[in-house]
Interface confidence: low
Amino acid sequence: DWVIPPISCPENEKGPFPKNLVQIKSNKDKEGKVFYSITGQGADTPPVGVFIIERETGWLKVTEPLDRERIATYTLFSHAVSSNGNAVEDPMEILITVTDQNDNKPEFTQEVFKGSVMEGALPGTSVMEVTATDADDDVNTYNAAIAYTILSQDPELPDKNMFTINRNTGVISVVTTGLDRESFPTYTLVVQAADLQGEGLSTTATAVITVTDTNDNPPIFNPTTYKGQVPENEANVVITTLKVTDADAPNTPAWEAVYTILNDDGGQFVVTTNPVNNDGILKTAKGLDFEAKQQYILHVAVTNVVPFEVSLTTSTATVTVDVLDVNEAPIFVPPEKRVEVSEDFGVGQEITSYTAQEPDTFMEQKITYRIWRDTANWLEINPDTGAISTRAELDREDFEHVKNSTYTALIIATDNGSPVATGTGTLLLILSDVNDNAPIPEPRTIFFCERNPKPQVINIIDADLPPNTSPFTAELTHGASANWTIQYNDPTQESIILKPKMALEVGDYKINLKLMDNQNKDQVTTLEVSVCDCEGAAGVCRKAQPVEAGLQI
């Protein structure tokens, strides 16, 4: 049987080497000479030769200093043979434990740790965590028992101990109130990790803490009074630029300004925010009226996109806006005037007066009237009074100039301001109908075939309006009824059918047709009738010598 005491060897031992560790014995040495040898890691496998054994005495020796952090345990096998080389024992496992020395200092996992904390964070708020490791034995010794401390804080303001570090975990927390990004946006801590629970080897690292923004500063007007001027009637005109400062982080919701006009019930102004520099751009939302109000004193408040984190006073500014008078065009009242007038209205008589008002009540101005568009040249206007009268006969049935019984004229009014301003009014003459048009036939030229002639429809047209139109009355005159007949084509008597009574010779005929409207206004029209050498429905045929209708009776 083997006799092997437990084996341990401290790392980093001084020489001289080789150094005895233990003496190995086999009980078989009582029966004869025993020779010892070892195999395994550190003996005959790498690292070779760290351990040796005296062949005859069994003394196990170490030949060089050990490093626990490289190899903490060696596993060897001891062998015993007799002088003839036969094994007298089974090989025995030998464990050599390398005991730890505090030969490694802690190492931080990063040279610089980065963290952040909200300004105004309360004590106890966790900020970040730093971590260090130590290669030494943390199971059987305190050689890797790390304790964390803060060595320094830069700046040491507003208190030199703004933060604390958990000695065991490395978690950094806020310990003092007063974190203010606007005063001290970053803190640099030098943190230490020391083994032996803080009493041994140490190392340092840097923790950089960024203080993040909260909306704890209001935007403030600077200056708080502004002046601007704007011409009347112009919308979207920049009046002035409002300046604010906000100590919070630029281009964040806590910095971005929101402007509110406190006394603009009419919504006549608007303030937009310049996203680049946070300026307030005051503009007109709609045109202002100098004659109504010459000056506005606006009170503008400024806040941020997000609510204030703490109770803050809202900054206000006063803006005096002067409205500048502009010469405005006279305004016709109404802008479109409708006048009903009979088409037989007397020439030279006054139809109506159409006048404009001068908006510039603060300027004494004279208005002059002119007719701008009068396509039929029917009208004239008094340049001083705006009285409009006829210069020629009106005609409702002048369809070139009259649409839907309405004649449109444009009137202009010009003031004597500087520069001159001109306003336009529209005059609509609604022309009432007079029965001044008799009915007429359409067509007036008609073709029949000599054989089996097809009756022809003649429409009756009257340019007037009801009741000066249908039902019409038609009558053949001057003996035309001898050869021709007419009958009404429809109940409204707006068309008739003409046909010959008998076979007619090829040739041209004139037929006198008397047409009368519902108000008994009549007119005799001569129809040009051609009888052609054809049968049934006639197209246009060659002209023959005219035959007077009266001669054909």
Epitope: P253, V258, A301, T303, N304, V306, P307, F308, E309, V310, S311, L312, T313, T314
Partner: antibody
Framework: EVQLLESGGGLVQPGGSLRLSCAAS????????MSWVRQAPGKGLEWVSA????????YYADSVKGRFTISRDNSKNTLYLQMNSLRAEDTAVYYC??????????WGQGTMVTVSS | QSALTQPASVSGSPGQSITISCTGT?????????VSWYQQHPGKAPKLILS???KRPSGVSNRFSGSKSGNTASLSISGLQAEDEADYYC???????????FGGGTKLTVL
């Protein structure tokens, strides 16, 4: 003890108006932004409106913009919600809540608003 | 802006742990550490249980914890108890006029 107590709820016809109040006690009311949050029957929570501690800034959900107005009277420790042009979809329990570091705390017990013809 | 996304329901047995997620965008959950969680029992007002992702107000059990990764925040409840059965809502501060977004709510059932 911190307390918020809403009142002013009730039945109103579509197109009608109501004014809710929320009386605060037990904390410095003027230092707190305040919000109204509503909960339709059987539904989830919906933020409606918020106002800064000073009353200078107001915020509205798109669904109520132009119809509801939030205001506060710090001298009376009271928050208000003026609701105009009410619609059936505005039917809900309305809660007032303190608003800081944006979260809602404390909460009132709620007041029921029913919009129905 | 649409609501934050929460699962409609989760369940667990007494003593177990559960997690409720709350997913938003880089304009809300991802942009700020202003995520809060609320517990609401039927017929009662909501109660703040976590603010600024993981901060517990005084009086709230340490069984409630919060975390955030990217655009998703999470509420974890360990050692489930019968009284934890309630609706849970997340909120996030958001860029723009909406100010505060709510999640759709998650019904927690303790089996």
């Amino acid at each position: 003890e911190v307390q918020l107590l809403e009142s002013g709820g009730g039945l109103v016809q579509p197109g009608g108006s109501l004014r809710l109040s929320c009386a605060a006690s037990g904390f410095t009311f003027s230092s707190y932004a305040m919000s109204w949050v509503r909960q339709a029957p059987g539904k989830g929570l919906e933020w409606v409106s918020a106002i800064s501690g000073s009353g200078g800034s107001t915020y509205y959900a798109d669904s109520v913009k132009g119809r509801f107005t939030i205001s506060r009277d710090n001298s009376k420790n009271t928050l208000y919600l003026q609701m105009n042009s009410l619609r059936a979809e505005d039917t809900a329990v309305y809660y007032c809540a303190g608003t800081a570091k944006p979260s809602f705390d404390p909460w009132g017990q709620g007041t029921m608003v029913t919009v129905s013809s | 802006q649409s609501a934050l996304t929460q699962p409609a329901s989760v369940s667990g047995s007494p003593g177990q742990s559960i997690t409720i997620s709350c997913t938003g965008t880089s304009n809300d959950v991802g942009a700020y550490n202003y995520v809060s969680w609320y517990q609401q029992h039927p017929g009662k007002a909501p109660k703040l249980i976590l603010s600024e992702v993981n901060k517990r107000p005084s009086g709230v059990s340490n069984r409630f914890s919060g975390s955030k990764s990217g655009n998703t925040a999470s509420l974890s409840i360990s050692g489930l108890q019968a009284e934890d059965e309630a609706d849970y809502y997340c909120t996030s501060y958001t860029m723009g006029s909406t100010f505060m977004l709510f999640g759709g709510g998650t019904k927690l059932t303790v089996l």
